[in-house]
């Protein structure tokens, strides 16, 4: 048995930050689980990890330098990514693993979410400012 995952096909990070919600066909509340977000078609970069155990506080971390936070819902984990760079525009995949109680479970690979990072466009000061008003 595999858990099914739903993600938005595309998200735009206008202010270098984005909320990516991973929706699962599975209730995580009474489970020890590891939810992770992976970057790239080959999922080579583990962007963020949310580790949950029903009796303890959620642990959220990134070992790859991403600024991330995570929030647990009944059947979802939302990853909040901040300080994204334009060159981090890519496809991102949600992964879920249920560690306990046994048996171990994971998900069917999802379709992923393309995160398009649009950098902050600071308005440049005009080269020839017009006459100042009195």
């Amino acid at each position: 048995n595999k858990i099914l995952v739903k993600q938005s096909p595309m998200l735009v990070a206008y202010d270098n930050a984005v909320n990516l919600s991973c929706k699962y066909s599975y209730n995580l509340f009474s489970r020890e689980f590891r939810a992770s977000l992976h970057k790239g078609l080959d999922s080579a970069v583990e962007v963020c990890v949310v580790y949950g155990n029903y009796s303890q506080q959620l642990q959220v971390y990134s070992k790859t330098g991403f600024n991330c936070d995570g929030k647990l819902g009944n059947e979802s984990v939302t990853f909040y990514l901040q300080n994204l760079y334009v060159n981090q525009t890519d496809i991102y995949f949600c992964k879920i693993e249920v560690m306990y109680p046994p048996p171990y479970l994971d998900n069917e690979k999802s379709n992923g979410t393309i995160i398009h990072v649009k950098g902050k466009h600071l308005c440049p000061s005009p080269l020839f400012p017009g006459p100042s008003k009195p």
Epitope: V98, P101, P102
Partner: antibody
Amino acid sequence: VQLQQSGAELVKPGASVRLSCKASGYTFTEYIIHWIKLRSGQGLEWIGWFYPGSNDIQYNAKFKGKATLTADKSSSTVYMELTGLTSEDSAVYFCARRDDFSGYDALPYWGQGTLVTVSA
Amino acid sequence: DIQMTQSPASLSVSVGETVTITCRTNENIYSNLAWYQQKQGKSPQLLIYAATHLVEGVPSRFSGSGSGTQYSLKITSLQSEDFGNYYCQHFWGTPCTFGGGTKLEIK
């Protein structure tokens, strides 16, 4: 899915007994088996569970030292040994299979129960 | 450990009536609760899982409700075959405690 339990046992105080629960109709190593006690005139009491896939075990603290859960994968059988028997251990013991309903647990399949009578 | 308080301990009702059995826990179990029926000399039978989901083949006169720490099993239009013992059980960690049981008798 079937859980076939061993027959009734009449045992003396202080003795031990081993009950069996033979599973069929599914992949034995993929499901947790729970054990439950039912004393006459009382309610159901959870003893513990055994996972044959990795030999993981969880006991109710009340039954630690009283019950020992093991399994034989070749015969798809889970065993529960009860030691140091007293009249308090006289009861019907059930095994039941835990199913995972998308993250919610329940026990949909039960054995027929084994009656253990402790008497001198 | 989670404490399960089931009430009432016994009920004497007539065929056709409606009954409600409740189960209270000392902490939130997030709907990780099952209800069972057990008849004399038989194995328990699962009726409801995840607090509200009816098991396939169980008559629709049985229904489960509740969340957090308070859960109920309702049986409408009681039939003669509904008499017996009823138990709730939580699955929020271990031990997976049962409620004390409710004995449903014919009046």
